[in-house]
Amino acid sequence: EEELQMIQPEKLLLVTVGKTATLHCTVTSLLPVGPVLWFRGVGPGRELIYNQKEGHFPRVTTVSDLTKRNNMDFSIRISSITPADVGTYYCVKFRKGSPENVEFKSGPGTEMALGAKPSAPVVLGPAARTTPEHTVSFTCESHGFSPRDITLKWFKNGNELSDFQTNVDPTGQSVAYSIRSTARVVLDPWDVRSQVICEVAHVTLQGDPLRGTANLSEAIRVPPTLEVTQQPMRVGNQVNVTCQVRKFYPQSLQLTWSENGNVCQRETASTLTENKDGTYNWTSWFLVNISDQRDDVVLTCQVKHDGQLAVSKRLALEVTVHQKDQSSDATP
């Protein structure tokens, strides 16, 4: 007969208030004949948690039927866990004795500690938008977890980031902890549709991490590029001039036409289209009345994007019967 071993596989068991805790204990031998009891703590002051033979333990149930002759599983469940239940639990084998049973061997013990799940991570981006090629900071916070050990990772579009700093507070003992992490992200022009993800893994989450997300669309500003062109065909005494505003984000945009420095109040036709990368294109058409007698006309397309300084593009129209495209230049 092999020597009796008392196996308590979990060194630490994290439980949540109100839930049921399962304390595992198996034996490798049925001998010597005698009961297995559960205690919290050691020494003369230890507290009896479960005795199959006698006593009233309303919150304790056994995982297996202990009356079965060949039972080797003495695991128990404790329901409605409270903070008062924390401590180290031992399954202890007794051999039959008289007048009392004699303690024979103890398991190594399982420490029961209260675990608290972290709150859902909240990711905050920068207060103001930034243009591509610049670095922006995102913060991630999660609170109320215990024990202190926690893992936090950052991802951008599924790719793990490495440029971040994380702090867990407080540094000393506490009933609950908080984590704060700041990640530095370099913006790319195509990041309108990108996401940053903060992932928090904790023992209480049983391998199912919590995630917080932020959309880079809230942090990025992609400035437009402008192009003004004159349509080659003339319709009567009107020429169609197009201002193409390309690849901008966000959508907020004001466009005005000027003719020889004078802002034109009349409406122009326009279309807004969205690109696959989430940026926008805006096309505006302006009809210019011309006559053979007029001086040359200089048209300016001015764009104010997302409250930034206006940018403009000029086009000089050559009013001749044989129109041809003129060179254009940009002014800030």
Epitope: E1, L30, L31, P32, V33, G34, P35, V36, N51, Q52, K53, E54, L66, T67, R69, N71, R95, K96, G97, S98, V102
Partner: antibody, heavy 120, light 107 residues
Framework: QVQLVQSGAEVKKPGASVKVSCKAS????????ISWVRQAPGQGLEWMGW????????NYAQKLQGRVTMTTDTSTSTAYMELRSLRSDDTAVYYC?????????????WGRGTLVTVSS | DIQMTQSPSSVSASVGDRVTITCRAS??????LAWYQQKPGKAPKLLIY???NLQSGVPSRFSGSGSGTDFTLTISSLQPEDFATYYC?????????FGGGTKVEIK
Amino acid sequence: QVQLVQSGAEVKKPGASVKVSCKASGYTFGGYGISWVRQAPGQGLEWMGWISAYGGETNYAQKLQGRVTMTTDTSTSTAYMELRSLRSDDTAVYYCAREAGSSWYDFDLWGRGTLVTVSS
Amino acid sequence: DIQMTQSPSSVSASVGDRVTITCRASQGISSWLAWYQQKPGKAPKLLIYAASNLQSGVPSRFSGSGSGTDFTLTISSLQPEDFATYYCQQGASFPITFGGGTKVEIK
């Protein structure tokens, strides 16, 4: 195989002593307790006492206290029951039985019994 | 001491009959009760332990129930080899005590 083999029948005079042996085989002797149970002719079962084959602790029935001694010899896997100052009402079949319950007491293996006759 | 009272002391029955034997403890013994079968000139044989657990090798026509003070042994369909004397035994505490026995006889 797993068994308990008891010593043979005895005839004793009143006032004498008897020592019955019970040899275990086929199992780990030290892992179990042994109880002794007797049965007078035509009567029911009467528990006499228990001994731990591991530690040697004993518990005897009140009415036999002082007259009975139970011992074990782990080297030979044998249990012994000695009854002194025999009386005619001690005439009975004496059984040894392996005690197998973990938190309780029951007997899953019995010897065939030893008849002890006390007669003048 | 815990007294064990068995009833009836004897019962006449035929092969195929359902037989029920009861055992009452003088105080609560949880489920620490065993049932034995004894045939003339033989040692007792364990049938049921811990009130309701069938000992290995015992036919399933034997069953036990009860808890606290009242317990029952049932033979669902009596077979010729079942004619014997049956004892209950409390194993809750020393001194261990047996019931007076129930003799199951052929009708």
